[in-house]
């Protein structure tokens, strides 16, 4: 299972549910579905209030039981460490894969934290982070922001990933904007 890590804004916008949580148990494998689930303790929800409705407490996260079919394996044994988890809802259950955005909260830049808590949502409706994987690449729409981090360094560690969001400048136009300047 291979996938290019997405820009955090893309992860936020494409996910049904974005939460902050601690992994508090060892994985359990369901003997019918062959999915494994991790027990989590959710501390914050950033996206998914409407999708979840009244069932606003997520206690488990589900993933395939094998890496080759994109199963996520949680390596940290620190049960007090908080993680940002962006996943999909299937039958009311939170599902993630190795391609999902799952990162220690403390590893996120202040700008990314701001993005997840407040700003990324502003760009979801109209704007698209467009990955530039090889030169030359050009914008296909005014609402696209060219994401070039992969050309220069690891995509998650790039400047655009860590500090910028693709946000509307005016109708029909999106541009990279600094999340730093928006931090109160």
């Amino acid at each position: 299972c291979t996938c290019v890590p997405p820009h955090p804004q893309t992860a936020f916008c494409n996910s049904d549910l974005v939460i902050r949580a601690k992994f508090v148990g060892t994985p359990e494998v369901n003997q019918t579905t062959l999915y494994q689930r991790y027990e989590i303790k959710m501390t914050k929800m950033y996206k998914g209030f409407q999708a979840l409705g009244d069932a606003a407490d997520i206690r488990f996260v589900y993933t395939p039981a094998m890496e080759s079919v994109c199963g996520y394996f949680h390596r940290s044994h620190n049960r007090s460490e908080e993680f940002l988890i962006a996943g999909k809802l299937q039958d009311g259950l939170l599902h993630i894969t190795t391609c999902s955005f799952v990162a220690p909260w403390n590893s996120l830049s202040l700008a990314q934290r701001r993005g997840f808590t407040k700003t990324y949502t502003v760009g979801c409706e109209e704007c698209t982070v467009f990955p530039c994987l090889s030169i030359p690449c050009k914008l296909q729409s005014g609402t696209h922001c060219l994401w070039t981090d992969q050309l220069l360094q690891g995509s998650e560690k790039g400047f655009q990933s860590r500090h910028l969001a693709c946000l509307p400048r005016e109708p029909g136009l999106c541009t990279w904007q600094s999340l730093r300047s928006q931090i109160a």
């Epitope: 994985p27 359990e28 579905t33 094998m66 080759s68 199963g71």
Partner: antibody, heavy 113, light 111 residues
């Protein structure tokens, strides 16, 4: 009581195909994931493949990926293993297992020219 | 291509206790509470003796017990009997390979 009965083993030439079946009884078949495990003569156990209760998720060992296909027919309470492009190293007793708690008696597959 | 390491053989006299170890990694034994132990007599199918590290299926003698510490699981057989002579295999879930077995341990009951 839980019963698993494998069939379909036999002698086949390298490059040939074989389809194993496992008839299950004594439990709600669709509620359990099923697996195939094999044991080469005088060797240890090797997991081959697994399938979820609905058949929607399938997993394979690297050694058989692309050559073997696991499937199930819940209406017939039967598990299958379609084996293509067989090699000498696939020679083994093949066991079907209910999520590893109950095992059949096995069926011998011999790949030889 | 064996992921879990077991001693090739162990032996003990009737009435004694023996322990078989099963060493893996944090992606299998250490990462899950899913270690099983199987007993296999020659020409027979494996029989589940312990599941989920330390649980015994109904019908299995309480002389068999399992435990785990870190990346190593153990099967202990107390009050060894002649019919315990068999091959024993450990198994664990593994997120890379779904499930893995140990290479097997031949238990010989002396005398």
């Amino acid at each position: 009581q839980v019963q698993l009965v494998e069939s379909g083993g036999g002698l086949v030439q390298p490059g040939g195909s074989l389809r194993l079946s496992c008839a299950a009884s004594g439990f709600t078949f669709s509620s359990y994931a099923m697996s195939w495990v094999r044991q080469a003569p005088g060797k240890g156990l090797e997991w081959v493949s697994a399938i979820s209760g609905s058949g929607g998720s399938t997993y394979y060992a690297d050694s058989v990926k692309g050559r073997f296909t696991i499937s199930r027919d819940n209406s017939k309470n039967t598990l299958y293993l379609q084996m293509n492009s067989l090699r000498a190293e696939d020679t083994a007793v093949y066991y079907c297992a209910r999520f590893f708690d109950y095992w059949g008696q096995g069926t011998l597959v011999t790949v030889s020219s | 291509d064996i992921a879990l390491t077991q001693p090739a053989s162990v032996s003990g006299s009737p009435g004694q206790s023996i322990t078989i170890s099963c060493t893996g990694t944090s992606s299998d034994v250490g990462g899950y509470n899913y270690v099983s132990w199987y007993q296999q007599h020659p020409g027979k199918a494996p029989k589940l003796m312990i599941y989920d590290v330390s649980n015994r299926p109904s019908g299995v003698s309480n002389r068999f017990s399992g435990s785990k510490s870190g990346n190593t699981a153990s099967l202990t057989i107390s009050g060894l009997q002649a019919e315990d002579e068999a091959d024993y295999y450990c198994q664990s879930y593994d997120y890379q390979q779904f499930t893995v077995f140990g290479g097997g341990t031949k238990l010989t009951v002396l005398g």
